[in-house]
C-alpha cells in the first residue's frame, strides 16, 4: 500500500516524535499545521535524528517532497557554513548533520528559500520557493517523557490502539508521548483505556497497571508478573514487588527505585516514593527539592573560625589576617610572620595538600563554589575600590547582598590588603573555572548583575536551551573557546557561580502567526536594557555540575546573564558536522571555526555602550529563538541570540563596535 495515499504516520523515541503528513502545503501552512498540533517542522540536526526521519519517510516516490524546518531570508547566504545561512524554525543555526543535494554554489541568494526533503533515495535536502505547495511535511514533537508500548496480553482481542496528543492513531508505536491514550480490547468483552501520565514519584507511566484483560489468573506465567502475582476479587491479577523494588510503568516488571539515580548524592530504597535521598557530610537537603543537596555554609556558624572563613562545596577553610597564622586546630589564629596560612576543613574527607596530583586538584577546584565570609571585626579590604578586571570580585560586607563567587587560588593564602589588579588572561579553559591570577584569588564582584531566572514553557529535551557540553578534544587551554557554559563531572552543585539568564518575552498562542504582513500582533517584542560594558571585562563562564537540576521544573539549565559579553580572542576548535553528500550517504565534514556561528553574538552596535537595547524576538514552545515564517517584510533588525545545542565559535575581535560576523536577525523569519 502506498504510504503517501495513507493517513499521517509517525515514529517516536523516548523524548520526541517525528510525524509525516502527506498533505500538500506551502512552507508557512506546514509550519502552522505543526504548531497547531503543539510541535514544529522537523529539525533533524544529528545523524541519529536523520536516521529516524529516514526510517519514517522510507522509500517514497522521487517526485514527492516534504518540508522540514529550515528557512533562509533573501540575501542571507553564508555558503561556508553547514546550513548555508539557513536557520532552523526553532531559531538557531546549530547542526551536526546536513544532507544537501548539491555542493554550495556562489550566488547572491536574492530570494527567501525554504528546504524540502526528497521522499526517495537518500532523502536529500533541496532548497526552493517557500510558497510552493509541496507534497507533505514533517513535524517534530518534543515531550517530557514517554511510556513504552504495552505488552500484548493473552486475553487481548487485538493490538492496543494508541492516540497521540498530536492526533495520530496507530498500533505501531514503540514509545507513546506523555498524554497519549492506549485503547485495549479484550476477548472477554470489555476493554480498557489507559493514559500516559506523570507518576507521583516522577517520570511518566501508564495510568493503570496491567494485566488489563481478564485471564486465567496468576497460574500461567505468574500472571506476567516479574515478582509477585495477586489475584484480585474482580478476577483481575495485579503484580507486586518484593521489598526494595517498585512496580515499573508496565505494571508487571519491578525496578530498583535508585537505579535511575533520582538522588543527587545518596539513595536508599524504601520510603513513600520507593526511595529516600540522603546527603553526605557537609551538605544538607535543599529546601525546595529534597533530591538535591546544598552545601552547608559552616561559615555562618558563629565561632567556626577565629578570624576569617571561606566556605566551599563540602567544607570550609579558616584564614588569619596579616601578622597571624593558623594554629594546628585549623580554627584559631596566633601572631606570626607576614604570610597568612589556611587550613582545609573538608567535610567530605577530600583534604587537599600540595602533594596531591594535579587531576585531583582540578576536581576539587571545579567543585569550589563558595563565598568569602569575613569574621566580625576584621576589615581586610577597602570596599570602595573594586579591582578593575573581568570577574571583578570583592569580599562580602554586611550591606552587600550581591552574589559572590570567588575562586581562591589553590596553594596561596588570600591577599590581606587591597590587592593590585591582577593579570587576567583573555583565554579561558573549557574544563575548569577561571583562575585569574597565579598568585591571587579573584574577588567577589562589585558590579555583579542580578540573576534573572529563565521563564519557559515546558520544553522537550530537543528544544530546551541546553547546557553546552564541553565535548571538545583535549586541547591546551589557549585553544578552548571562552564564552561557553561547561558541563562538569558529577559533583555537588551547591553555591554555583552566577547563572547566565534571559527572560523570554511572552509566548504566542500556538494558533497565532505573528509578524506577517497581514497579521499585526501587538506587544510581542520585548526590549532588554543591558548594562554598560565596563572596560577590560573578560567573559563570564558558567560552570555547571553534571547533576545540577533546573531551578524550576520547566526552566532550562543554561541561563544567560543579561549583560553585554565582550568578545575574546581565542583559537577555536572545529565543529564536526556530519553531512551526506550526493556521492556518499553520510560522511563527516570538519567545518573550520570561521564557518561557525558566534557562540553568544551579543551585539555591540557602533554607539556608546550605555543604555543599549536589544530586541528579543518572541519565542514559542519547543523553541530557542524561533522565527515566524513570512513571505515579505521590513529590513532586518539586530537581536540577542542565545547559544544552542553545539559549542560554536566566538567572534574574535575584542570590543569591536561593529561586527560583520554577527548574524543579523530578520523579523520576517520563523
Amino acid at each position: 500500500q502506498d504510504p503517501w495515499a495513507a493517513e499521517p504516520r509517525s515514529a517516536c523515541g523516548p523524548s520526541s516524535c517525528y510525524a509525516l503528513f502527506p498533505r500538500r502545503r506551502t512552507f508557512l501552512e506546514a509550519w502552522r499545521a505543526c504548531r497547531e498540533l503543539g510541535g514544529d517542522l522537523a529539525t533533524p540536526r544529528t545523524p541519529e535524528e536523520a536516521q529516524r526521519v529516514d526510517n519514517l519517510v522510507g522509500a517514497g516516490p522521487a517526485s514527492r517532497l516534504l518540508w522540514i524546518g529550515l528557512q533562509r531570508q533573501a540575501r542571507q547566504c553564508q555558503l561556508q557554513r553547514p546550513l548555508r545561512g539557513f536557520t532552523w524554525t526553532t531559531g538557531d543555526q546549530d547542526t551536526a548533520f546536513t544532507n544537501w543535494a548539491q555542493p554550495a554554489t556562489g550566488g547572491p541568494c536574492p530570494a527567501q528559500r525554504c528546504v524540502a526533503l526528497e521522499a526517495s533515495g537518500e532523502h536529500r535536502w533541496l532548497e526552493g520557493s517557500c510558497t510552493l505547495a509541496v507534497d507533505g511535511y514533517l513535524c517534530q514533537f518534543g515531550f517530557e517523557g514517554a511510556c513504552p508500548a504495552l505488552q500484548d496480553e493473552a486475553g487481548q482481542a487485538g493490538p492496543a490502539v494508541y492516540t497521540t496528543p498530536f492526533h495520530l492513531v496507530s498500533t505501531e508505536f514503540e514509545w507513546l508521548p506523555f498524554g497519549s491514550v492506549a485503547a485495549v480490547q479484550c476477548q472477554a468483552g470489555r476493554g480498557a483505556s489507559l493514559l500516559c501520565v506523570k507518576q507521583p514519584e516522577g517520570g511518566v507511566g501508564w495510568s493503570r497497571a496491567g494485566p488489563l484483560c481478564l485471564g486465567a489468573g496468576c497460574s500461567p506465567d505468574n500472571g506476567g508478573c516479574e515478582h509477585e502475582c495477586v489475584e484480585e476479587v474482580d478476577g483481575h491479577v495485579s503484580c507486586r514487588c518484593t521489598e526494595g523494588f517498585r512496580l515499573a510503568a508496565d505494571g508487571r516488571s519491578c525496578e530498583d527505585p535508585c537505579a535511575q539515580a533520582p538522588c543527587e548524592q545518596q539513595c536508599e530504597p524504601g520510603g513513600p516514593q520507593g526511595y529516600s535521598c540522603h546527603c553526605r557530610l557537609g551538605f544538607r537537603p535543599a529546601e525546595d527539592d529534597p533530591h538535591r543537596c546544598v552545601d552547608t555554609d559552616e561559615c555562618q556558624i558563629a565561632g567556626v573560625c577565629q578570624q576569617m572563613c571561606v566556605n566551599y562545596v563540602g567544607g570550609f577553610e579558616c584564614y588569619c589576617s596579616e601578622g597571624h597564622e593558623l594554629e594546628a586546630d585549623g580554627i584559631s589564629c596566633s601572631p606570626a610572620g607576614a604570610m597568612g596560612a589556611r587550613a582545609s576543613q573538608d567535610l567530605g574527607d577530600e583534604l587537599l595538600d600540595d602533594g596531591e596530583d594535579e587531576e585531583d586538584e582540578d576536581e576539587a577546584w571545579e567543585a569550589f563554589g563558595g563565598g568569602w565570609t569575613e569574621m566580625p571585626g576584621i576589615l581586610w579590604m577597602e570596599p570602595t575600590q573594586p579591582p578593575d578586571f573581568a570577574l571583578a570580585y570583592r569580599p562580602s560586607f554586611p550591606e552587600d547582598r550581591e552574589p559572590q563567587i570567588p575562586y581562591p587560588e589553590p596553594t596561596w593564602p588570600p591577599p590581606l590588603s587591597a590587592p593590585r589588579v591582577p593579570y587576567h588572561s583573555s583565554v579561558l579553559s573549557v574544563t575548569r573555572p577561571v583562575v585569574v591570577s597565579a598568585t591571587r584569588p579573584t574577588l567577589p564582584s562589585a558590579h555583579q548583575p542580578p540573576v534573572i531566572p529563565a521563564t519557559h514553557p515546558a520544553l522537550s529535551r530537543d528544544h530546551q536551551i541546553p547546557v553546552i557540553a564541553a565535548n571538545y578534544p583535549d586541547l591546551p587551554s589557549a585553544y578552548q573557546p571562552g564564552i561557553l557554559s561547561v558541563s562538569h563531572p558529577a559533583q555537588p552543585p551547591a553555591h554555583q557561580p552566577p547563572m547566565i539568564s534571559t527572560r523570554y518575552p511572552e509566548l504566542f498562542p500556538a494558533h497565532q502567526s505573528p509578524m506577517f504582513p497581514d497579521t499585526q500582533v501587538a506587544g510581542t517584542q520585548t526590549t532588554t536594557h543591558l548594562p554598560a560594558i565596563p572596560p577590560n571585562r573578560a567573559p563570564l563562564v558558567t560552570t555547571l555540575g553534571a547533576h545540577q537540576p533546573p531551578q524550576a521544573p520547566d526552566a532550562p539549565v543554561l541561563r544567560t546573564q543579561a549583560t553585554q559579553l565582550p568578545i575574546i580572542p581565542t583559537a577555536q576548535p572545529s565543529l564536526t558536522t556530519s553531512s551526506r553528500s550526493p556521492v556518499s550517504p553520510a560522511h563527516q565534514v570538519s567545518v573550520p571555526a570561521a564557518t561557525q556561528p558566534p557562540a553568544l553574538p551579543t551585539l555591540l552596535p557602533s554607539q556608546s555602550p550605555t543604555n543599549q537595547t536589544s530586541p528579543i524576538s518572541p519565542t514559542h514552545p519547543h523553541s530557542k529563538v524561533p522565527q515566524i515564517p513570512r513571505e515579505d517584510g521590513p529590513s532586518p533588525k539586530l537581536a540577542l541570540w542565545l547559544p544552542s545545542a553545539a559549542p560554536t565559535a566566538a567572534p574574535t575581535a575584542l570590543g569591536e563596535a561593529s561586527l560583520a560576523e554577527h548574524i543579523q536577525r530578520d523579523d520576517r523569519w520563523l
Epitope: D2, L65, P103, T105, A111, T131
Partner: antibody, heavy 124, light 108 residues
Framework: QVQLVQSGPEVKKPGASVKMSCKAS????????IHWVRQGPGQRLEWMGY????????TYNQKFKGRVTMTLDKSASTAYMQLNSLRSEDTAVYYC?????????????????WGQGTLVTVSS | DIQLTQSPNFLSASVGDRVTITCRAS??????VAWYQQKPGKAPKLLIY???NRYTGVPSRFSGSGSGTDFTLTISSLQPEDFATYYC??????????FGQGTKLEIK
Amino acid sequence: QVQLVQSGPEVKKPGASVKMSCKASGYTFTDYVIHWVRQGPGQRLEWMGYINPYDDDTTYNQKFKGRVTMTLDKSASTAYMQLNSLRSEDTAVYYCARRGNSYDGYFDYSMDYWGQGTLVTVSS
Amino acid sequence: DIQLTQSPNFLSASVGDRVTITCRASQNVGTAVAWYQQKPGKAPKLLIYSASNRYTGVPSRFSGSGSGTDFTLTISSLQPEDFATYYCQQYTNYPMYTFGQGTKLEIK
C-alpha cells in the same frame, strides 16, 4: 536523453472525443509527474491537469472537470489524455510536459521537458 | 485564480540590445515563477525557474529576478536566435499553473 513523443494530429467533430498519447523515454517514468497544457490559436498556454505515474494520482483544472480523463500505461511509459464533448473552442495544440523535481539542488515545479504537441481541430 | 500580466505584448529590438520583459502576478507567488521561450510551431522551452535560476544549458545572457508579485526576464545582449515569444508561468498554487499572455520579441 529525455524525450516526450506525442501522437499525431486529430480532426474531430463537435461532441466527439479525442484521445492522444505521450510516450516518455530517457528517464524513470514513475519518478516524474506528467502535465497536459493546451494552446489555442493565438492564445496563451492553459494548464489542463496532471497525472502522477507513481500512484496514478490525478488533478484536473476545474474548467475541464467532467470532460477530461488522464490515464497511464506504465509498462509502455505512456500517458494518455482524453477530452470528451469537443467544441470548436477546443481547437488547439495539446502538449504533454514533464514536471521537474529538482535542478542543481533546487526543488521546483516548472516544466522541464515538453512533447512536440498534438494539434486537435474541432470542426463540423 | 492567480492572473499573470506580461508587458509589453510586443517588443521590437535589434541584435545586441538589452531587453527586459516584466510579469506581474495578481497576488504574492513568492518565487514560484518560470520563464519559457517558444518559437512558432514548437513547444515551449524552459529558461528560468524559481524566478532567478537559469535552467541547464540556457545561455548566461538570460537572467530572471523578482519575488512576490513583480518579475523580470532580462536578455543582456540579444542574439538572432532569441527572437521568439516569451511566457511567464506561476506555480505557487500548484498544481494550478497559470501563464502570462506572452511577449512577442521581434527584430526591429
